[in-house]
């Protein structure tokens, strides 16, 4: 038998420095977690203790804090190189700055292979990107070789900016021939490493013949065996065992997100490459693990350039700004209300006596809200805090839509409610009531919108044939998160201001903020 230790991270989202327990900015260092310096300490400890170790990342290193805003991926390459990652799969967020924003800072600088079997380049890009990422890599570990095959969410064109010269194929269809190649190279220990979410990870384990282990990302899935060490509630045991169609037991793992945990999986293979046993757990990277001094010093050196962003107080909050995915992807959250209020405020244009304003409505995909802000840091809100909340560098745009399109959008908002998906809408100038007992596509039972052609704004039922102005992220205007109806049916689209700037301007103007959850989004059952 031969034993392999797989260390894995996913969805780190630019958390290079240690963070608070909820993965926002570290306030009380003695209770902070994660960060690359602490991760390195644990990785090195395991490398010294165990003979056959791989350190893998399942994508979405990009995007999430001021580090990415300023360094644009150079920080990812630098610190992943320093930690000596063995391989990485491309995530959807690796394309947030376009293909060039992936090639130059990361693909050309990474001293480890970057993988995806289901992304195919075409046109002029094909020769430019050739060899910079690979479908698979055979890594030598001890006296054996291990095949790593990569995959990326085929939804990436809807979630990021990969451009028109990359084709994202079905994961299973693309993976099978690459795994077959590895088998033909007499490589009999194969890891699928990728970024398509836990449901797809399980499907890959079930359907792709020859895959021994699946290391995933994208859905921020926390798996744990036993009593979990922090706030995250396990979605299942670690590893999660899937029985493949050909009768094998395939371990599937993921390690939550934000560098809070280091996935730790031990696999025992027989001489024919069959998995005999698998066990482990994510390791919570809490303050009991010291930060590596040399990596920490390097972080501090890189940090200097960020300080201009960090030190300037924009305003204060006297309430917790709840931007957690657990709230904003499931119900009205006060961070969503704050952002939508800022978006409307930024578009105040009193150009007609008949209208108090030309626009009263805001919609915002909950998945675009990426972090909370804790008020217990003297209430201070900085640009850095906002960059963690709104890390994508998007714009808040003005569109004109028919009421019928808005109704479709709100049905889409809850069509698969409960899976922590990003399309759940936060709102401003809208009151919506959902009945989740009804079938998808028929769950919006009340949709009232704030009038504009009025001296005293009030909520009136949405009219299907009326044309409304709405402020929304450019991501939604472009059909992101599955809002194809907006892209296809919008009547006018005007580009707006940078998202962080809109919110920072609003906070600076208000000086002290205290957004509440106030009944913009409600759930009910029964007749209306």
């Amino acid at each position: 038998a031969w034993e392999l230790t797989i260390l894995h991270t996913n969805d780190v989202h630019s958390r290079l420095e240690q963070t608070s327990e909820d993965s926002s900015k570290c306030v009380n260092a003695s209770r902070c977690m994660g960060g690359v310096a602490r991760l390195f300490t644990k990785v090195q400890q395991i490398r010294r203790a165990e003979p056959n170790v791989l350190l893998l990342d399942a994508g979405d290193q990009y995007q999430g804090t001021i580090w990415f805003t300023v360094y644009k991926g150079a920080e990812v390459a630098h610190f992943m190189n320093a930690l000596r990652y063995d391989a990485m799969a491309l995530g959807n967020h690796e394309f947030d700055n376009g293909v060039e924003g992936l090639i130059e800072p990361l693909l050309k600088e990474a001293k480890f292979p970057i993988l995806s079997a289901n992304i195919k380049a075409k046109g002029p890009l094909a020769s430019q990107i050739s060899g910079l990422y690979l479908p698979y890599k055979v890594l030598p570990v001890g006296d054996e070789v291990v095949g790593i095959v990569g995959y990326t969410s085929k939804e990436t064109p809807f979630l990021s900016n990969p451009g028109t010269n990359l084709v994202f194929e079905d994961e299973i269809t693309a993976l099978q021939p690459e795994v077959d190649k590895l088998k033909t190279l007499n490589v009999n220990k194969i890891i699928a490493l990728g970024h398509s979410g836990f449901e797809m990870d399980k499907l890959i384990a079930q359907k792709v013949r020859g895959v021994d282990v699946v290391v995933g990302g994208h859905s921020n899935t926390f798996l744990y065996t036993g009593n979990p060490p922090s706030k995250e509630v396990p979605a299942g045991k670690y590893p999660f065992i899937v029985t493949s169609d050909d009768g094998r037991k395939v371990p599937v793992v993921q390690a939550y997100a934000f560098g809070k945990y280091l996935g730790y999986l031990k696999i025992e293979f027989d001489e024919r490459g069959n998995v005999i046993s698998s066990h482990g757990n994510p390791i919570l990277l809490n303050s009991s693990i010291p930060e590596d001094p040399s990596i920490k010093a390097d972080i501090n050196k890189w940090r200097i350039k960020l300080d201009n962003y960090s030190t300037q107080e924009l305003g204060k909050t006297i309430v917790y700004l709840d931007g957690s995915s657990q709230s904003c992807r499931f119900r009205e959250c006060n961070m969503g209300n704050l952002i939508c209020d800022a978006m409307i405020n930024n578009n105040l244009r009193h150009t007609d006596e008949m209208f108090w304003n030309h626009v009263s409505m805001c919609i915002l995909n909950g998945g675009g809200i990426r972090s909370p802000i804790d008020e217990r840091n003297n209430g201070t809100i900085t640009w850095e805090n906002l960059a963690a909340v709104l890390p994508f560098g998007g714009t808040f745009d003005l569109v004109q839509l028919k009421g019928s399109t808005l109704k479709k959008a709100f049905e889409h908002s809850v069509h698969r409610y409960g899976q922590s998906t990003g399309e759940f809408l936060q709102v401003g100038g809208i009151h919506v009531v959902y009945d989740l007992s009804r079938k998808p596509g028929d769950r919006v039972v009340k949709l009232d919108v704030l009038c504009t052609k009025c001296r005293v704004p009030s909520y009136d039922p949405l009219k299907m044939d009326e044309v409304y102005k709405v402020i929304l992220p450019n991501f939604l205007a472009n059909g992101g998160d599955g809002f194809q109806m907006i892209k296809d049916e919008l009547l006018r689209h005007d580009s707006g201001d940078q998202d962080i700037n809109v919110v920072s301007t609003y906070i600076s103007k208000m000086k002290v903020i205290y957004p509440a959850v106030e009944g913009r989004i409600k759930f009910s059952t029964g007749s209306h």
Partner: antibody, heavy 118, light 107 residues
């Protein structure tokens, strides 16, 4: 573009050692295997071993184990092959080569002739 | 170790001819076979891998076929620059092994 440039020809006495270098450029050195291949005059090709600079893993052909040492200097993007206790049958051209994605030799150095003669 | 036996060891042909070189493996190597061209005093050049995948820049007159133990390199219409020695290699398992070579000469 990918380039592998090897050190110059060497003449050595039996029993001595020789160290051949292979400097890589035009790609990320750590991400691809470097293989060493031997070709005796007028003969075929023999795989000596590999090094994977990413984790400095080394594998030798059993036939060459004991007298060959393969190393790499990541900072210099250079691989080395040292052959000790030289004998006349070690007279050969030694090539370094790089993989495309494991196991076949896509790019080759120009070769280094090592002559063992008393 | 897997032995790779090439045939013929040498052959004479003319420009424009269709030429076939075969390689027999001592055990099943599936489609894990590569072909190289070597000219005197030069390093080998990769022509084909995975039995039939041409390396970047290799002319389409070079093709490979086979599976299991029997593999073939075909040059559909010989050009003057094709006269050289050709080697097959199995990339199925270590130690990677080569055929003894086929010298292609001008008739």
């Amino acid at each position: 573009q990918v380039q592998l440039v090897q050190s110059g020809a060497e003449v050595k006495k039996p029993g001595a050692s020789v160290k051949v270098s292979c400097k890589a450029s035009g790609y990320t050195f750590t991400n691809y295997y470097i293989y060493w291949v031997k070709q005796r005059p007028g003969q075929g090709l023999e795989w000596i071993g590999w090094i994977y600079p990413g984790n400095l893993n080394i594998k030798y052909n059993e036939k060459f184990k004991g007298r060959v040492t393969i190393t790499a200097d990541k900072s210099a993007s250079t691989a080395y092959m040292e052959l000790s206790s030289l004998r006349s049958e070690d007279t050969a051209v030694y090539y370094c080569a790089r993989d495309d994605n494991y196991a076949w030799f896509a790019y080759w150095g120009q070769g280094t002739l090592v002559t063992v003669s008393s | 170790d897997i032995q790779m036996t090439q045939s013929p060891s040498s052959l004479s042909a003319s420009v424009g001819d269709r030429v076939t070189i075969t390689c027999k493996a001592s055990q099943d190597v599936s489609t894990a076979v590569a072909w190289y061209q070597q000219k005197p005093g030069k390093a080998p050049k990769l022509l084909i891998y995975w039995t039939n995948t041409r390396h970047t820049g290799v002319p389409s007159r070079f093709s490979g076929s086979g599976s299991g133990t029997d593999h073939t390199l075909t040059i559909s219409s010989l050009q003057p620059e094709d006269f050289a020695t050709y080697y097959c290699q199995q990339h199925y398992s270590t130690p990677f092994t080569f055929g003894q070579g086929t010298k292609l000469e001008i008739k």
